[in-house]
Interface confidence: medium
């Protein structure tokens, strides 16, 4: 019977998508670049069901964790690599009294079990998404 | 808003090191890739690398036996030196933030700086 | 190394008229998250160069709705849909795809 495999090794899959959980630290533009190179993405969270699961890898491991979200466009406008803004809603996911740009911090990194606002330079693990293959057929 | 100064001697030996420093001010150095870029009199442009930290960097390979670049975060600047210089390094010399693969482009440059190599 | 030629080199253009410059790279510079990597820039006469394009078409802050930037892959193109005479100088494209960056050799737009 052939088997089908909707994400690559070592990936992980949640409703549709795949995730690369990180082994090594990078900065947030150089773990933008890692991810394009697997044609992937920086991760884009869409889903209150999304943050919740990416929340629990991280918290987890108990590391800090690039996603792809950063105000560099515009200070205090937050908007995601593929373009899209920050929705009101998923700004509860903050940690309390963040963001608070101390220090020039433009990129967004999960952070026990919440986010926070950090400098882009500094070298964090991060996660890569990508569509899963598709097993029908 | 951010903006960038070079500096440096203008004038620098054969075989020596060319040596410039970009100050940034109105921003943080933190959060961008910076980068160097040169152009001999009446010629175009050419790029000879970039820097995020000082461990993170992508160097031209033309001159990458000879380029080295580092920032200093806490006096907001980053420097560009050039071993063993000739005749051929006399240029143009520019600075300029690299807004990375995420935002795209060169934005602001410097005014530029003239290094002459002579003896 | 990827190579960029731009054509032409030199173009005469009378204010109030249409210019187009073209920039053709030797590889394709779409990458698969949809974007190309490919950037424009405008030297003016004794200044810095300056930002006008960037990711294939869009108009950096503060340029003028008369320049545009279209296509992708391989072939790309700067208008400028009227030229004014403070748009003389020399355009560049470069990839920024992969390094080392790269860029064309340059067209010097003038006033007939």
């Known amino acids: 019977e052939r088997l089908c495999h909707p994400c690559p090794w070592e990936w992980t899959f949640f409703q549709g998508n795949c995730y690369f959980m990180s082994n090594s630290q990078r900065n947030w533009h150089d773990s933008i670049t890692a991810c394009q190179e697997v044609g992937a993405q920086l991760v884009v969270i869409k889903s209150a069901e999304e943050q919740n699961f990416l929340q629990l890898q991280s918290s987890r491991s108990n590391r800090f964790t690039w996603m792809g979200l950063s105000d560099l466009n515009h200070e205090g406008t937050w908007q995601w690599v593929d373009g899209s803004p920050l929705l009101p809603s998923f700004k509860q996911y903050w940690n309390k009294g963040e963001p608070n740009n101390v220090g020039e911090e433009d990129c967004a990194e999960f952070s026990g079990n919440g986010w926070n606002d950090d400098k882009c330079n500094l070298a964090k693990f991060w996660i890569c998404k990508k569509s899963a293959a598709s097993c029908s057929g | 808003q951010v903006q960038l100064q070079e500096s440096g001697p203008g004038l620098v030996k054969p075989s020596e090191t060319l040596s410039l420093t970009c100050t940034v001010s109105?921003?943080?150095?933190?959060?961008?890739?910076w980068t160097w870029i040169r152009q001999p009199a009446g010629k175009g442009l050419e790029w000879i690398g970039r820097v995020f930290t000082s461990e993170s960097t992508n160097y031209n390979p033309s001159l990458k036996n000879r380029v080295t670049m580092s920032v200093d975060t806490s006096k907001n600047q980053f420097s560009l030196r050039l071993n063993s210089v000739t005749a051929a390094d006399t240029a143009m010399y520019y600075c300029?933030?690299?807004?990375?693969?995420?935002?795209?482009?060169?934005?602001?440059w410097g005014q530029g700086t003239l290094v002459t190599v002579s003896s | 190394d990827i190579v960029m030629t731009q054509s032409p080199l030199s173009l005469p253009v009378t204010p109030g008229e249409p210019a187009s410059i073209s920039c053709r790279s030797s590889q394709s510079l779409l990458h698969s998250n949809g974007y190309n990597y490919l950037d424009w820039y405008l030297q003016k006469p004794g200044q810095s160069p300056q930002l006008l394009i960037y990711?294939?078409?869009n108009r950096a802050s503060g340029v003028p709705d008369r320049f545009s930037g279209s296509g992708s892959g391989t072939d790309f193109t700067l208008k400028i849909s009227r030229v004014e005479a403070e748009d003389v100088g020399v355009y560049y494209c470069?990839?920024?795809?992969?390094?080392?960056?790269?860029f064309g050799q340059g067209t010097k737009l003038e006033i007939k």
């Open positions: 300029a933030r690299d807004r990375g693969t995420y935002l795209g482009g060169f934005d602001p």
């Open positions: 109105g921003g943080s150095i933190s959060s961008y890739y």
């Open positions: 990711l294939g078409s």
């Open positions: 470069i990839q920024a795809l992969q390094t080392p960056f790269t």
